[in-house]
C-alpha cells in the first residue's frame, strides 16, 4: 500500500529572465527512493538516481542546475517555461510517486511566489 | 543520518573575498550533488552555484558568474564556494544543500546556513 505524500512549491511565478528553484519532498513512507525524475509536460528535464547521480538532459544543460537537494533550479526562464512540471519519486516497494507545480513566467514585475515552500 | 556542516561566513567589506565551506558527515554512500543557495531578508531563497559531483559539472547563477567559484573535494565529501568581488547585495545566508544516496536510497538535506555580510 502506497503511504506517502509529496509536498510541492505549488503554484509559483517568476521573472522572465530570472530563475526558480522547484522543490518537492516526498514523506510519511519509509520506501527506497531509486530515482528521482524532474519532468516538463512530456519533456526530460533532469534525473537523480541513487546509483548513478544527477544527469541534465543535454538539451537543458545550459539553464537547469541540480539542486537544492533533490529539487531542481531553471534560469534565464522565458515565457515559453510556462507550465506544468512534475517530480517523479520511483520507490521500492511502494511504486511510482508524483508531484506537480505549475511555473507562470511573467513578462513584467508583477511575478509572485505562491506559498513558501521549506525543507525541513 | 547525513548532516552538512558549513563554515566560512562573516562581515567583509565590499570588493572583499570569502570562502565558505560545507562538509557532509555520518552514513552515505555517495553525494550526489552540493550547492549553495541564498536568502535574504524578507526575500525568497535563491540559486547561487552547485556542483555535480559525477562529472564535477558546474552551474552558477548569473549574478555571481566571473565572480565565485564552486569546487568540491571528493575525499572530504566537502564543497567550496570561493566569493571574491563581494557586493553589497551578496549579504545573505548562505545555505549548503546535498543530494545522496544511501542505503535507503537517495535523499537530501539542508545545512543551517551562515552569514555573510558586506558592508563597509
Known amino acids: 500500500m502506497m503511504t506517502g505524500t509529496i509536498e510541492t512549491t505549488g503554484n509559483i511565478s517568476a521573472e522572465k529572465g530570472g530563475s526558480i528553484i522547484l522543490q518537492c519532498h516526498l514523506s510519511s513512507t519509509t520506501a527506497q527512493v531509486t530515482q528521482v525524475n524532474w519532468e516538463q509536460q512530456d519533456q526530460l528535464l533532469a534525473i537523480c538516481n541513487a546509483d548513478l547521480g544527477w544527469h541534465i538532459s543535454p538539451s537543458f544543460k545550459d539553464r537547469v542546475a541540480p539542486g537544492p537537494g533533490l529539487g531542481l533550479t531553471l534560469q534565464s526562464l522565458t515565457v515559453n517555461d510556462t507550465g506544468e512540471y512534475f517530480c517523479i519519486y520511483h520507490t521500492y516497494p511502494d511504486g511510482t510517486y508524483t508531484g506537480r507545480i505549475f511555473l507562470e513566467v511573467l513578462e513584467s514585475s508583477v511575478a509572485e511566489h505562491g506559498a513558501r515552500f521549506q525543507i525541513p | 543520518e547525513v548532516q552538512l556542516v558549513e563554515s566560512g561566513g562573516g562581515l567583509v567589506q565590499p570588493g572583499g573575498s570569502l570562502r565558505l565551506s560545507c562538509a557532509a558527515s555520518g552514513t552515505f554512500q555517495r553525494i550526489n550533488a552540493m550547492g549553495w543557495f541564498r536568502q535574504a531578508p524578507g526575500k525568497e531563497r535563491e540559486f547561487v552555484s552547485t556542483i555535480n559531483w559525477s562529472g564535477s559539472n558546474t552551474y552558477y547563477a548569473d549574478s555571481v558568474k566571473g565572480r565565485f567559484t564552486i569546487s568540491a573535494d571528493n575525499s572530504k565529501n566537502t564543497a567550496y564556494l570561493q566569493m571574491n568581488s563581494l557586493k553589497p547585495e551578496d549579504t545573505a545566508v548562505y545555505y549548503c544543500?546535498?543530494?545522496?544516496?544511501?542505503?535507503?536510497?537517495?535523499?537530501?538535506?539542508w545545512g543551517q546556513g551562515t552569514l555573510v555580510t558586506v558592508s563597509s
Open positions: 544543500a546535498s543530494s545522496y544516496s544511501s542505503s535507503s536510497g537517495l535523499g537530501d538535506i
